[in-house]
Amino acid sequence: IWELKKDVYVVELDWYPDAPGEMVVLTCDTPEEDGITWTLDQSSEVLGSGKTLTIQVKEFGDAGQYTCHKGGEVLSHSLLLLHKKEDGIWSTDILKDQKEPKNKTFLRCEAKNYSGRFTCWWLTTISTDLTFSVKSSRGSSDPQGVTCGAATLSAERVRGDNKEYEYSVECQEDSACPAAEESLPIEVMVDAVHKLKYENYTSSFFIRDIIKPDPPKNLQLKPLKNSRQVEVSWEYPDTWSTPHSYFSLTFCVQVQGKSKREKKDRVFTDKTSATVICRKNASISVRAQDRYYSSSWSEWASVPCS
Amino acid sequence: RNLPVATPDPGMFPCLHHSQNLLRAVSNMLQKARQTLEFYPCTSEEIDHEDITKDKTSTVEACLPLELTKNESCLNSRETSFITNGSCLASRKTSFMMALCLSSIYEDLKMYQVEFKTMNAKLLMDPKRQIFLDQNMLAVIDELMQALNFNSETVPQKSSLEEPDFYKTKIKLCILLHAFRIRAVTIDRVMSYLNAS
């Protein structure tokens, strides 16, 4: 048993039929010695008396909020959560495996630039009685500070018969230099609690590997005289690291017909303009990627040819 | 249709062209190592990230763009200098700060060159003949060092009397290539910044 937060404890259980469980001793946080009784959750059934209560925790029915009272007054609470281990593996029932970029990916993170700010998100099909807590650091043996906000529900989607909920959190490295060469990864730890079930999930990455720029901005077309060609121009996204001559981007320009089957013309350039042939009913899209370190491409910015 | 990107005129800023070649060469070599040594811990997640230049050169700090010198987190405990203007030591007179930055890059290249050559000598003795260093990468390191045009003593290649442990050597190669790729990215950023200055 270990303390997760003040008055909240996690009991780690080997989960198999007829498992003996864990013996837990709860102590009432009070100077009082006599006349103390214990109850569980909303029940008025007295489980025991005295300053300590010894319980055998085997299943979820044994978890919950244990309260000690004296003469109708609440003295203190101890909330017990269960962490299941099945065949030597901690349960991962709460979050959905996103399977990208590989199996057992429960947390995904992205950064728009090298400022040390990043966003992580995760998916669940659980709609209620759900709490997350996020911690992060740079390195684990001598951790350096990363501050994370509260997790929030960021999207709801219908997937077949199921509803899927996306939660996200923003974190900021306390002292980040955009030009630094990372040698220690960022560690992200998410505590997830559903009803009385506790689980934890972790992710480890370098900011350079999770970079995904915002799409280029101010995408414009300028027709060239007596030609089917147009000059496409754009700008670096506002969120990208500066100076741009140091944190340079490379771009992919695509001409795409109305039909997905039509051949796509693609041009790669380091400049912020390109000359392409604009076909009728086609659209021109531009996306960006770090010029020197091949992490993710941005989403496309698009304009119609007409 | 994938149209290649036009490379800038090398006469304009020789080091930019060489640094781009360097990044391409080290990235290709790293990819080859990851594929060839697929049963060795050679991915970014698996290796220890070591920097052989740590406490010997200070390229990131010495080459910090002027705009980032206001960022407290970039001004570590070391005495930091930063780029102001100029180009590679090709034509125009460069400032003291720039010379410091470029000489730090030169020292990095020299250290990696020695390590890679020593390692290649060991790999050539491997009866499996599984992987060797790309001669193109070694040549590109040499070209950039020449373009930087610093005179410094030649560091003798390390020689070892004991029998090489080929498993350890291959893991060391992965560590070295990952670190050198990261440094090559920094060098490319610096050259791009100088080219724009």
């Epitope: 909240v8 609470h77 209620t128 509260a150 929030t152 609690v193 | -």
Partner: nanobody, 123 residues
Framework: EVQLVESGGGLVQAGGSLRLSCAAS????????VGWFRQAPGKEREFVAA????????RYADSVKGRSTISRDDAKNTVYLQMNSLKPEDTAIYYC????????????????WGQGTQVTVSS
Amino acid sequence: EVQLVESGGGLVQAGGSLRLSCAASGRTFSTYAVGWFRQAPGKEREFVAAISWGGGTVRYADSVKGRSTISRDDAKNTVYLQMNSLKPEDTAIYYCAARVLHIATKAVDFGSWGQGTQVTVSS
């Protein structure tokens, strides 16, 4: 059950700000999630914001998202709702409510309620 007392309401001009407080009695507040609800005259009680035990998860109604921030200070047994860019339609009695552990958006899921604090936004 935990006892709750709201404060910080009042009359404010449109575009102004208010900070509501919800103080809990007892030393056992840290295991509770707290929600803010509001009820305008002749309307149903509606969810505004909620914060979990430990403050690790927050939730906001679409109507206040981006304008409100919920936070908690367990050392003071208090939850705060900072409301900015107030609009006349934010006029209502604001209630705080508590339940063990998890946040919820339905009033029926909360066991303990405060008496409420009046917020009036004039145009």
